[in-house]
Interface confidence: medium
C-alpha cells in the first residue's frame, strides 16, 4: 500500500481542516488508514482523524482543530496499521479556504430594487470576520447565457441591484461565495442557491422611451 498523491490540506481558519490524498489502488480509507495530526510544541495527545473514501483510491479527512493562530504548524502522519506511509506538515494560515456564506435571501419588497443579503460565516472574534469579500452569482433558469457575477468588495454582506437589470417575468437564482485577500485564500464553496421570480415592470413612459430609443437605432 502506497500513497500516490500526497495529502493536501485546507483550513477554514476556524475549527476544521480538510486533507485529501490518493492511494495507489482501491482502499477502504476508514478501516485501513489513520491520519495523526499534532500541533508543533503541543504536549497533549496527537489527534487521530479517521478518513472517508473519496472515490475508489481517494481519501478525505476532516481534522478537528482549535481556533487557528497564524503561526500554528501541524505535523501530519499517515498510518496504515503500524506502517508509516507519509509524514508531512501543514500550516493552516497558509492554506485557507473560507467557509461558505449562508442564509442568502432575496428581498423583493422594494419594487425597483433587489436586495440580496447573506450571513458572514465567521463569528466576530475570528480574524476573517472583517476580511471577507464576496462574489454573487445570479443566473436565469430559463436562459443559460443570462449569467452574471457581482463582486462585493465592501464588508457588508449585502448587494443592491436594480431589478430592471434583470429580465422581467422570469425566475432567477443567486448564490454567493467568499474569499479573504489578507491570507490569499482560495474561494469558498458557493452557498446554497436561492430562487425568486423577477416581476419588475417598467413604468409606461420609461417603457415607451426605451422603444423610441430603440427605433432610432
Amino acid at each position: 500500500m502506497k500513497v500516490l498523491q500526497e495529502p493536501t490540506c485546507v483550513s477554514d481558519y476556524m475549527s476544521i481542516s480538510t486533507c485529501e490524498w490518493k492511494m495507489n489502488g482501491p482502499t477502504n480509507c476508514s478501516t485501513e488508514l489513520r491520519l495523526l495530526y499534532q500541533l508543533v510544541f503541543l504536549l497533549s495527545e496527537a489527534h487521530t482523524c479517521i478518513p472517508e473514501n473519496n472515490g475508489g483510491a481517494g481519501c478525505v479527512c476532516h481534522l478537528l482543530m482549535d481556533d487557528v493562530v497564524s503561526a500554528d504548524n501541524y505535523t501530519l502522519d499517515l498510518w496504515a496499521g503500524q506502517q508509516l506511509l507519509w509524514k508531512g506538515s501543514f500550516k493552516p494560515s497558509e492554506h485557507v479556504k473560507p467557509r461558505a456564506p449562508g442564509n442568502l435571501t432575496v428581498h423583493t419588497n422594494v419594487s425597483d430594487t433587489l436586495l440580496l443579503t447573506w450571513s458572514n460565516p465567521y463569528p466576530p472574534d475570528n480574524y476573517l470576520y472583517n476580511h471577507l469579500t464576496y462574489a454573487v452569482n445570479i443566473w436565469s433558469e430559463n436562459d443559460p447565457a443570462d449569467f452574471r457575477i457581482y463582486n462585493v468588495t465592501y464588508l457588508e454582506p449585502s448587494l443592491r441591484i436594480a431589478a430592471s437589470t434583470l429580465k422581467s417575468g422570469i425566475s432567477y437564482r443567486a448564490r454567493v461565495r467568499a474569499w479573504a485577500q489578507c491570507y490569499n485564500t482560495t474561494w469558498s464553496e458557493w452557498s446554497p442557491s436561492t430562487k425568486w421570480h423577477n416581476s419588475y415592470r417598467e413604468p409606461f413612459e420609461q417603457h415607451h422611451h426605451h422603444h423610441h430609443h430603440h427605433h432610432h437605432h
Epitope: L39, F41, L42, L43, S44, E45, M65, D66, D67, V69, S70, A71, D125
Partner: antibody, heavy 119, light 108 residues
Framework: EVQLVESGGGLVQPGGSLRLSCAAS????????MSWVRQAPGKGLVWVST????????SYPDSVKGRFTISRDNAKNTLYLQMNSLRAEDTAVYYC????????????WGQGTLVTVSS | DIQMTQSPSSLSASVGDRVTITCRTS??????LAWYQQKPGKAPKFLIY???TLAEGVPSRFSGSGSGTDFTLTISSLQPEDFATYYC??????????FGQGTKVEIK
Amino acid sequence: EVQLVESGGGLVQPGGSLRLSCAASGFTFSTYGMSWVRQAPGKGLVWVSTINSNGGSTSYPDSVKGRFTISRDNAKNTLYLQMNSLRAEDTAVYYCARFFRFRNAMDYWGQGTLVTVSS
Amino acid sequence: DIQMTQSPSSLSASVGDRVTITCRTSENIYSYLAWYQQKPGKAPKFLIYNAKTLAEGVPSRFSGSGSGTDFTLTISSLQPEDFATYYCQHYYGPPTWTFGQGTKVEIK
C-alpha cells in the same frame, strides 16, 4: 469531572529532599502533558517543570534544573516531582496542572500542596 | 526567555465597572497567550486562551484581545465574584512558560 489532588508537601530542612505526588482522575491521563507550577507566599505563579504525555520529554527552568525531576506513572494516573537539595527560596505552594487539549495553556489545576524549607 | 509585563499591578474598582488589564511581551508571541484568575487560597482558574477565546464555562463579560506583543483582558461589568488576581501566561515556543507578575483587582 477532572480532578488533580497533590500530596507530599511539608516542612523540610535546607538541603533536604521531598517527593510530591499528583493523583489525576476524570480524564485519560496518559494522553495529556502535565506541569508543576509554584507560588511563593504572597508572590506570583512560577513554572517549575513539564512532562509530555508519555514521559519521554521533560523541561525545567534554570532555577530548578539539576535539582528537581518530574516523572509520571500512566498506569497509576499519577504525576511526581522529586525535589532534592532544597533551598529556602523553594518554599511555596506547588500546583500540578494539566495542559489543555489543543494548546500549551493549563486548563485544570490541583488545590496545591505547601512545601516549607526552613531550619 | 520571553519576558511578560503586566499592568497595573493592582487596581481598585466597583461592581459594574469596566476593568482592563494589559500584558506586554518582550517578543512576538502571535496569539499564544492565556489568562488565569486566582482567588486567595485557591488554585488558578483557566479563563482565556489564544489571546481571545473563552475557556468553557467562563462568563461572556470576560474578553481578551491583542496579538504580537500587546494583549488585554477586559471585564465589561465587574461582578462581586470577579475580585481576584489575574495572570497572563505565554505558551509560544515551549519548553519554557512564563507568567506575568499578576494584577490584583480590589474593591474600591
